[in-house]
């Protein structure tokens, strides 16, 4: 297993509709053709997998149908979008990249993107 550098923004603020997007960029030392991207959420020292996708270079990322993630790839960059976020989902979202094939296998883990989610205020009742 060889190490690889992964960069991602430090902070992202989710939209009022609970959507957060960020770029995960990896410094590919090899000529990888198949890449696996995993988003991990770290909160209260607990790490859970949010979503994962394997894609072929030059092709689109395909997450599972019920995944809250979508994404596109361009070269060594992956544009990730996480939907359906609520205030309780605020936390550190870590991008993990694996160059799966061909050998050698490379693993890179970013420092994480702190995503802040603020639930929208309910609209006040109107007398009109």
């Amino acid at each position: 297993c060889k190490a690889m550098h992964v960069a991602q923004p430090a902070v992202v603020l989710a939209s009022s509709r609970g959507i957060a997007s960020f770029v995960c960029e990896y410094a590919s030392p090899g000529k990888a053709t198949e890449v696996r991207v995993t988003v991990l959420r770290q909160a209260d020292s607990q790490v859970t997998e949010v979503c994962a996708a394997t894609y072929m270079m030059g092709n689109e990322l395909t997450f599972l149908d019920d995944s809250i993630c979508t994404g596109t790839s361009s070269g060594n960059q992956v544009n990730l979008t996480i939907q359906g976020l609520r205030a309780m989902d605020t936390g550190l979202y870590i991008c993990k990249v694996e160059l799966m094939y061909p050998p050698p296998y490379y693993l890179g883990i970013g420092n994480g993107t702190q995503i802040y989610v603020i639930d929208p205020e309910p609209c006040p009742d109107s007398d009109f």
């Epitope: 297993c1 198949e34 072929m56």
Partner: antibody, heavy 120, light 111 residues
Framework: EVQLLESGGGLVQPGGSLRLSCAAS????????MSWVRQAPGKGLEWVSG????????HYADSVKGRFTISRDNSKNTLYLQMNSLRAEDTAVYYC?????????????WGQGTLVTVSS | QSVLTQPPSASGTPGQRVTISCTGS?????????VHWYQQLPGTAPKLLIY???KRPSGVPDRFSGSKSGTSASLAISGLRSEDEADYYC???????????FGGGTKLTVL
Amino acid sequence: EVQLLESGGGLVQPGGSLRLSCAASGFTFSSYAMSWVRQAPGKGLEWVSGISGSGGYIHYADSVKGRFTISRDNSKNTLYLQMNSLRAEDTAVYYCATYSSGLHDAFDIWGQGTLVTVSS
Amino acid sequence: QSVLTQPPSASGTPGQRVTISCTGSSSNIGAGYDVHWYQQLPGTAPKLLIYDNNKRPSGVPDRFSGSKSGTSASLAISGLRSEDEADYYCAAWDDSLNGWVFGGGTKLTVL
């Protein structure tokens, strides 16, 4: 338990065809590249073919290029090797091999092997 | 003719230290690809002995060690035991062949 189980070997005449299968269990099959490795009687190991986890990337040894086809069905956790235009020198025990998480470039999971005999 | 070159045989007495070499080229070992070693006991499937040049999978005794330098690698077995009698193979990915290459194998005899 992580396991690979090959099947489909047997006796076939030169020029004939055979399809080997390798059933995988105990790990996330679709995440890992798989390979076929063969061993002729009394000889050493020879890598035959490899396929990426998605099946999108495939490589063959020069000795089988154009005759053998590797494929996988991730919904069935099964790896295949379609062998056509078989020759006497293809006689060997065929192993499927892969790696578990953390050992991504070394085959630490092997099947028991299936014997292919090409003879008239 | 194998792409990786190993001595066909090696031998030693119990307790001795034995070394098996594996020589490659600039498209495999010399290209920076890791070397892995497999042990094959008679009539059984190969077993991973050393991976990533010098790492041991769990369950493999520390009598087995590996090293790599330039275009070659070696496997050392210290405190030789009768159960070490087997065939040993080195392997690495080859850039120009786009595939795995194995050494021809070394038959180790414990005298």
